[in-house]
């Protein structure tokens, strides 16, 4: 096709597993937004592959990816963000393997910050309030956060709880007296735009007041 | 500051090769795309060829596909244009070009060498 | 293949007046456009990229507007350093191409 690259050699191109996946970042870096690719197999040799987006773009039809290691990725404004794009693994000019995705389905959120945990003694109670850059966006504003905590002796027993504003009421009764706690959040787009769960939150570690003899509740 | 200084212009005649080069210091070669573009004389720009800032993807115009091969030696902060089976029409003041955008493929040119002229004649 | 064409190719402009150029393109080029100014003997200078934005260090005079096939570079009130060939370039697709040029001289 007129104007368009040479391939390269493919040699045994054809029998490896290309199979990828993507998520964006709106609005990641001010107004760029960012998209992000890898082979879901690990091994796979990318020694010669790219990842090229088409469609739905603004000024220019196609955008090569940029390598950095493993990963392939774009940060730019010029995402349409309606409709879908093609998304391929090429070498030279021959497409490997390509998927039709609409990068409103697959975006993940940054994760929250700021997590933090004040023991109110007259209520009884935990106000866990943690922050998210979302607040301040123009597209991705509408997250369901998921906050899990933990005993911290308790390796696997995560107890969950859903919730769309930033901040949570965690009842003193309904945790261990004397007991180090483990807390953390994540979030998920959820309104409009679909994708996956951000990264956690770094952990927050609080202790609950050991239990008052005389009344029977938590120092 | 970036610098663009393109070398290897001279008279062929037609049938001939030259191989052009492009010598680039002020910036990281390895992350832009890069490109030649002509200018017969009197005459309009003609753009000629585009590799990525891989080095993995070529492009050109139908006038000078298979005639003309463009390469990068980021080692070397050097673009080449090899040019083979000149003709007449290949007369031109040759620019290298860099894109204002780094990585992707945003190919509107920020800075330009200042020329090298091959004369194609007999 | 996307075909450019500039127009007029060339304007005569008293210095202080306003210039207006064209460049219409085959098909919609989505915004991928940009304006370069060339002094003989000189490389081509950019001026204006994604259609309307302005390059770095360009003075306010000049501009960019348009969208789908129809563009357009104003100099709002010309100087004497702004007599020129000024050539639009697309970049939404492969083959780049450029327009003819306009040759904007002083009447």
């Known amino acids: 096709e007129s104007g368009y690259a040479q391939n390269g050699d493919l040699e045994d191109a054809e029998l490896d597993d290309y199979s990828f996946s993507c998520y964006s970042q709106l609005e990641v870096n001010g107004s760029q937004h960012s998209l992000t690719c890898a082979f879901e197999d690990p091994d796979v040799n990318t020694t010669n592959l790219e990842f090229e987006i088409c469609g739905a773009l603004v000024e220019v039809k196609c955008l090569n990816f940029r390598k950095l290691q493993e990963i392939y990725f774009i940060e730019t404004k010029k995402f349409l963000l309606i409709g879908k794009s093609n998304i391929c693994v090429k070498v030279g000019e021959k497409s490997l393997t390509c998927k039709k995705i609409d990068l409103t389905t697959i975006v993940k959120p940054e994760a929250p910050f700021d997590l933090s945990v004040i023991y109110r003694e007259g209520a009884n109670d935990f106000v866990v309030t943690f922050n998210t850059s979302h607040l301040q966006k123009k597209y991705v504003k509408v997250l369901m956060h998921d906050v899990a905590y933990r005993q911290e002796k308790d390796e696997n027993k995560w107890t969950h709880v859903n919730l769309s504003s930033t901040k949570l009421t965690l009842l003193q009764r309904k945790l261990q007296p004397a007991a180090m706690y483990e807390i953390k959040v994540r979030s998920i787009p959820d309104h409009y735009f679909k994708g996956f769960w951000s990264e956690w939150s770094p952990s927050y570690y609080f202790r609950t007041p050991e239990i008052n003899n005389s009344s029977g509740e938590m120092d | 500051q970036v610098q663009l200084v393109e070398s290897g212009g001279g008279l062929v005649k037609p049938g001939g090769s030259l191989r052009l080069s492009c010598a680039v210091s002020?910036?990281?070669?390895?992350?832009?795309?890069m490109a030649w573009v002509r200018q017969a004389p009197g005459k309009g720009l003609e753009w000629v060829a585009t590799?990525?800032?891989?080095?993995?993807?070529?492009y050109y115009p139908d006038s000078v596909k298979g005639r003309f091969t463009i390469s990068r030696d980021d080692a070397k902060n050097s673009l080449y244009l090899q040019m083979n089976s000149l003709r007449a029409e290949d007369t031109a003041v040759y620019y290298c070009?860099?894109?204002?955008?780094?990585?992707?493929?945003?190919?509107?040119?920020?800075?330009w060498g200042q020329g090298t002229l091959v004369t194609v004649s007999s | 293949e996307i075909v450019m064409t500039q127009s007029p190719a060339t304007l005569s402009v008293s210095p202080g007046e306003r210039a207006t150029l064209s460049c219409r393109t085959s098909?919609?080029?989505?915004?991928?456009l940009a304006w370069y100014q060339q002094k003989p003997g000189q490389a081509p200078r950019l001026l204006v990229y994604?259609?309307?934005s302005l390059h770095i260090g360009i003075p306010a005079r000049f501009s960019g507007s348009g969208s789908g096939t129809e563009y357009t570079l104003t100099i709002s009130s010309l100087q004497s350093e702004d007599f020129a060939v000024y050539f639009c370039?697309?970049?939404?697709?492969?083959?780049?191409?450029f327009g003819g040029g306009t040759k904007v001289e002083i009447k």
């Open positions: 070009a860099r894109p204002m955008s780094a990585h992707y493929g945003f190919n509107y040119f920020d800075y």
């Open positions: 002020g910036f990281t070669l390895s992350d832009y795309y």
């Open positions: 590799i990525s800032a891989s080095g993995l993807r070529t």
């Open positions: 098909e919609d080029i989505y915004n991928g």
């Open positions: 994604s259609a309307n």
């Open positions: 370039q697309q970049y939404y697709d492969y083959p780049l191409a």
